[in-house]
Interface confidence: low
């Protein structure tokens, strides 16, 4: 069957980095610079994807395959294949129209991207909070009021959360 | 204050193009994304793609791949939607629309181009 | 393509009346999710972004919740301006995707 299709048709027995030039007797032709086929048999080539302004380059196109980018200091992506870019804030922030704002109280990010979210409302397990919760950190739930025996100190506070991406030192 | 102001309605054959434009002011084109939604009579919003104006660059609906060309002219703050091989099915309004470049956002509304396409 | 089901596509109500708008994505969109406001013969209006962020001047009478894949509008008082149809909108990837669109009518 293969066979029969590239006596058919012999764009299909062009590879993936060339282009079947219509204008050429249906030849194999490289893709011209800043352009790339992925896969054989193509007619064209794809423009390469340019990472301009407040995206930067991760990988560079080549022949066989598209450009990757990815954001400039300061930006992360968003969206598949890095469609966005949204400017990073400080952990306790969050990104608004109006630019980095910092979480209101009762609030935190652990984070340079996404949104301020609720502390842990330690009350709805039936824990009491151990450690209170900051811009950039929740609270620490506790055993309930009822498991301390009156007298008893308060369990020991974990160490600090790590931040997120973060291994131990 | 912020404006896009889009050109007038337009009436084309089948197999025809249209080339609806978007005037910006009030801001700086290249500090935003330009996007394009069409909505055709009585259903829902459709978007298409949009351009970043500082440099040309396009995203489009797979959609419309291959029919739809979004350009941009920044001395004139001008943004340009042209649409080929026209059929009926592209009988709509067409929105420029713009939002802030780290939200993709639409948040500022051209009036809208109306585009009937009929034979 | 993520697709954006919105639900429901018409709704009668009075005056006063609570109004909940539900829109579902075929995937996940983190907190990408906008609602529009739209009135016939007008362009849209963004009412709300990033689920739960109102643009200035939009009455404290609409708000956003959702996370993940279902997301809500809610409108608490209904008011005669607010009939009109809401059309949700996810902004995670492209193509965006709008929801079909609830057309809100007065009982």
């Known amino acids: 069957f293969e066979r029969t299709r590239s006596l058919q048709d012999p764009c299909s027995n062009c590879p993936a980095g060339t282009f079947c030039d219509n204008n050429r007797n249906q030849i194999c032709s490289p893709c011209p610079p800043n352009s790339f086929s992925s896969a054989g048999g193509q007619r064209t080539c794809d423009i390469c994807r340019q990472c301009k302004g407040v995206f930067r380059t991760r990988k560079e196109c080549s022949s066989t395959s598209n450009a990757e980018c990815d954001c400039t200091p300061g930006f992360h992506c968003l969206g598949a294949g890095c469609s966005m870019c949204e400017q990073d804030c400080k952990q306790g922030q969050e990104l608004t129209k109006k630019g980095c704002k910092d979480c209101c109280f009762g609030t935190f990010n652990d984070q340079k991207r996404g949104i301020c979210r609720p502390w842990t409302n330690c009350s709805l397990d039936g824990k009491s909070v151990l450690v209170n919760g900051t811009k950039e950190r929740d609270v620490v739930c506790g055993p309930s009021p009822a498991d301390l025996s009156p007298g008893a100190s308060s369990v020991t506070p974990p160490a600090p959360a790590r931040e997120p991406g973060h291994s131990p030192q | 204050q912020v404006q896009l102001v889009q050109s007038g309605a337009e009436v084309k054959k089948p197999g025809a193009s249209v080339k609806a434009s978007c005037k910006a002011s009030?801001?700086?084109?290249?500090?935003?994304?330009i996007h394009w939604v069409r909505q055709a009579p009585g259903q829902g919003l459709e978007w298409m793609g949009r351009i970043d104006p500082a440099n040309g660059n396009s995203e489009y609906a797979q959609k419309f791949q291959g029919r739809v060309t979004m350009t941009r002219d920044t001395s004139t703050s001008t943004v340009y939607m042209e649409l080929s091989s026209l059929r009926s099915e592209d009988t709509a309004v067409y929105y420029c629309?713009?939002?802030?470049?780290?939200?993709?956002?639409?948040?500022?509304w051209g009036q809208g181009t109306s585009v009937t396409v009929s034979s | 393509d993520i697709q954006m089901t919105q639900s429901p596509s018409s709704v009668s109500a009075s005056v006063g009346d609570r109004v909940t708008i539900t829109c579902k994505a075929s995937q996940p969109i983190n907190t990408y999710l906008s609602w529009y406001q739209q009135k016939p013969g007008k362009a849209p209006k963004l009412l709300i972004y990033?689920?739960?962020r109102k643009v200035d001047g939009v009455p404290s009478r609409f708000s956003g919740s959702g996370s993940g894949t279902d997301f809500t509008l809610t409108i608490s008082s209904l008011q005669p301006e607010d009939f009109a149809t809401y059309y949700c909108l996810q902004y995670l990837d492209f193509p965006y995707t709008f929801g079909g669109g609830t057309k809100l009518e007065i009982k």
């Open positions: 629309t713009t939002g802030n470049l780290h939200y993709a956002l639409m948040d500022y």
């Open positions: 990033r689920v739960n």
């Open positions: 009030g801001f700086n084109i290249q500090d935003t994304y």
